[in-house]
């Protein structure tokens, strides 16, 4: 009977452009939030976030792998990628006080989901959740969460870049996280 | 000719660990908030908020069920799971007497989505938004998003839980809700 | 031998209600931002964006269109649906003032998404986020998450609209963005 | 109450194999790893494996990666060690622990429940 | 791998005196490394966790510090059922591996 078609398995108005696959063996990672070691960065450059990958509720699987705060892309296509970063700070100083230190510009937090392609030199932004912070209380907290839909390629590499690493709460798997997977 | 593999259908260098199943046929909820009743909870415990699953846009499909507060997951698999609450409050009265009544303690809101195996009395969180509340408006509102992918077992239920049961919109379907999908 | 059925490849517990089709194939878009042009809208309506489709991280694929502020549901199904809009403001004027203006109201920032189908006039609103605001700093920025999984039908249309399209960050395509797929 | 119980040790042959079983309750299986450790008569403790019942990643002590198979059963809230090409120097008393992990990035927890051991002997 | 060593092996005291255990590993560990209480017979129980948390249940005489390289298992006042075998476990790289452990001995 020689290869059979995906399409035959398809209605006939149907066009399949694509061989059937199972969804059981598609590329996926959950990763969850770890103690961050300070690292050097340059001035206008944001530090990437490292990951927990295998404990608790986080796993890779199907040749998705984590590697030195990059998820690595096993298989080119359409990706859902997200992540939520819960910021914690104190801002006990009143805020015309730190407004004075930080003139026209207000204190802020950032997320950025990064693509890296190794033949291209710049990164690419895929994600960006920013929000300036006039918190009045003592102690501020919230998160910023991020998720869409990125066309990939073999061989991209993911990573969450944050506006400032020390604001991080990196005290439950819950709080911060960053995930991929094949639709 | 026997029974066809799956794998005959995907391209030589590609592994197929799972049998090929429809989309269509795939676990699937959308849940949307309705009014609350208030119920006892203890002190330190969140409590769980209940939804409406037929009504308007909701829906639970393919032997996902609704029961109880709970969302029962019918077949072990990698879910995303997803849910907005909007609270709205009022803080008439200045922000230094409530932070008299409540010292050291910036008030905040809180959601957590939550996972229940019946042969293990404690809940697993899965993910949590966490947010001070520093508004000095006489009212205030403002939703907080959650979304990943996780690993459940059958028989596993999801619930959500909040900080003050009280605070929650219930007045829109589409600013309250709760939701899950086989991937 | 005919054309044999998809659930030959499912394991015999198991029921497939539809037929196997590729995932390559299925209805997808991501559109980013892109500057408003000022628009005529009924006082208590709210404006839709209009968006890009096709430039940078921005694509349409398998039958999902993008025309005239709308995505156009090729085909009937469960679809993801999500959106980031990003705002922007300045509130140089003292709180008090701002709130004379408005009586009783606070400022506020919404974004939903709502479908249209031709065949009913009125359209459905699916998500909402809606969040006061209370900044006391000159300038502010924040962003509003939306997901959620939806049953749509052929021909049916998403657009997103905001509160106040003048407050739209237009300035990246990682900033605000709106994006279906179907599950 | 959380609980552990190995079994499966026994008497085998040089070039034999044995699979042991834990089987765990009182807690949710899913969420901590569990491991395999060894202690060789008069000896010290020895990691063997490790396997995320969440997501079924695994681990081996480098002596012993080819030879020893860990695997899992959530249905079952079961946990498995295959051991193939035994030799004299396997001979020990086979412990599964649960790897507390506290759900928080400040933490890497440590093996807060075992079982009470059963032992393998390779002899000939 | 990561080896790890214990000092002393063997260790004579007295109930009441102060017993200090020492662990040392050929590479950082930053803070991961457990502590293990093990008694003829027995199965090993954890004591401490993350270089200085104590475990559910465990006496606040026992106590942890030390990260990267250096560690140290302190029992304030040894009682008697402290007399046993102590074992420390890095868990920052795979493979985990234990010391060869400590025995703490009535003099």
């Known amino acids: 009977m020689g290869a059979l078609k995906g399409q035959e398995f398809a209605p006939s108005h149907q066009q399949v452009y694509a061989p059937l696959r199972a969804d059981g063996d598609k590329p996926r990672a959950h990763l969850t939030v770890v103690r961050q070691t300070p690292t050097q960065h340059f001035k206008n450059q944001f530090p990437a976030l490292h990951w927990e990958h295998e404990l608790g509720l986080a796993f890779t699987k199907n040749r998705m792998n984590y590697t030195n705060k990059f998820l690595l892309i096993p298989e080119s296509g359409d990706y859902f990628i997200y992540s939520q970063v819960t910021f914690r700070g104190m801002t006990s100083e009143s805020s015309e006080i730190r407004q004075a230190g930080r003139p026209n510009k207000p204190d802020s937090i950032t997320v950025v989901i990064t693509k890296v392609t190794d033949s291209y030199p710049e990164p690419t932004q895929l994600l960006m959740g920013t929000k300036s912070v006039s918190e009045v209380g003592s102690n501020w907290f919230q998160p910023i969460y991020l998720g869409a839909m990125f066309s990939l390629q073999e061989g991209d590499k993911l990573m969450v870049n944050v506006s400032d690493i020390s604001l991080v709460d990196y005290t439950k798997e819950d709080k911060t996280f960053f995930g991929a997977f094949l639709l | 000719m026997g029974a066809l593999k799956g794998q005959e259908f995907a391209p030589s260098h590609q592994q197929v660990y799972a049998p090929l199943r429809a989309d269509g046929d795939k676990p699937r909820a959308h849940l949307t908030v309705v009014r609350q009743t208030p119920t006892q909870h203890f002190k330190n415990q969140f409590p769980a908020l209940h939804w409406e699953h037929e009504l308007g846009l909701a829906f639970t499909k393919n032997r996902m069920n609704y029961t109880n507060k709970f969302l029962l997951i019918p077949e072990s698999g990698d879910y995303f799971i997803y849910s907005q609450v909007t609270f709205r409050g009022m803080t008439s009265e200045s922000s230094e007497i409530r932070q008299a009544g409540r010292p050291n303690k910036p008030d905040s809101i809180t959601v957590v989505i939550t996972k229940v195996t019946d042969s293990y009395p404690e809940p697993t969180q899965l993910l949590m938004g966490t947010k001070s509340v520093s508004e000095v408006g006489s009212n205030w509102f403002q939703p907080i998003y959650l979304g990943a992918m996780f690993s459940l077992q059958e028989g596993d239920k999801l619930m959500v839980n909040v900080s003050d049961i009280s605070l929650v919109d219930y007045t829109k379907e589409d600013k309250t809700f709760f939701g899950a999908f086989l991937l | 031998m005919g054309a044999l059925k998809g659930q030959e490849f499912a394991p015999s517990h198991q029921q497939v209600y539809a037929p196997l089709r590729a995932d390559g194939d299925k209805p997808r878009a991501h559109l980013t931002v892109v500057r408003q042009t000022p628009t005529q809208h009924f006082k208590n309506q709210f404006p839709a964006l209009h968006w890009e489709h096709e430039l940078g991280l921005a694509f349409t694929k398998n039958r999902m269109n993008y025309t005239n502020k709308f995505l156009l549901i090729p085909e009937s199904g469960d679809y993801f649906i999500y959106s980031q809009v990003t705002f922007r403001g300045m509130t140089s004027e003292s709180s008090e003032i701002r709130q004379a203006g408005r009586p009783n109201k606070p400022d506020s920032i919404t974004v939903v998404i709502t479908k249209v189908t031709d065949s009913y006039p009125e359209p459905t609103q699916l998500l909402m986020g809606t969040k006061s605001v209370s900044e006391v700093g000159s300038n502010w920025f924040q962003p509003i998450y939306l997901g959620a999984m939806f049953s749509l039908q052929e021909g049916d249309k998403l657009m997103v609209n905001v509160s106040d399209i003048s407050l739209v960050d237009y300035t990246k395509e990682d900033k605000t963005f709106f994006g279906a797929f179907l599950l | 109450e959380v609980q552990l119980v190995e079994s499966g040790g026994g008497l085998v042959q040089p070039g034999g194999s044995l699979r042991l079983s834990c089987a765990a309750s009182?807690?949710?299986?899913?969420?901590?790893?569990i491991s395999w450790v060894r202690q060789a008569p008069g000896k010290g403790l020895e990691w063997v494996a490790w396997?995320?019942?969440?997501?079924?990643?695994?681990h081996y002590a480098r002596m012993l990666q080819g030879r020893f198979t860990i695997s899992r059963d959530n249905a079952k809230n079961s946990l498995y060690l295959q051991m193939n090409s035994l030799r004299a120097e396997d001979t020990a008393v086979y412990y599964c622990?649960?790897?507390?992990?506290?759900?928080?990035?400040?933490?890497?927890?440590?093996?807060?429940?075992w079982g009470q051991g059963t032992t393998v002997t390779v002899s000939s | 791998e990561i080896v790890m060593t214990q000092s002393p092996a063997t260790l004579s005291l007295s109930p009441g005196e102060r017993a200090t255990l020492s662990c040392r590993a050929s590479?950082?560990?930053?803070?991961?490394l457990a502590w293990y209480q093990q008694k003829p017979g027995q199965a090993p129980r954890l004591l401490i966790y993350?270089?200085?948390n104590r475990a559910t249940g465990i006496p606040a005489r026992f106590s942890g510090s030390g990260s990267g390289t250096d560690f140290t298992l302190t029992i304030s006042s040894l009682q008697p059922e402290d007399f046993a075998v102590y074992y420390c476990?890095?868990?920052?790289?795979?493979?985990?591996?234990f010391g060869q452990g400590t025995k703490v001995e009535i003099k």
């Open positions: 622990a649960r790897e507390n992990y506290y759900g928080s990035g400040a933490y890497r927890g440590g093996m807060d429940v």
């Open positions: 009182g807690y949710d299986f899913t969420y901590y790893g």
């Open positions: 396997i995320s019942t969440y997501n079924g990643n695994t």
């Open positions: 590479q950082s560990v930053s803070s991961y």
């Open positions: 993350d270089a200085s």
């Open positions: 476990q890095q868990r920052s790289n795979w493979p985990w591996t």
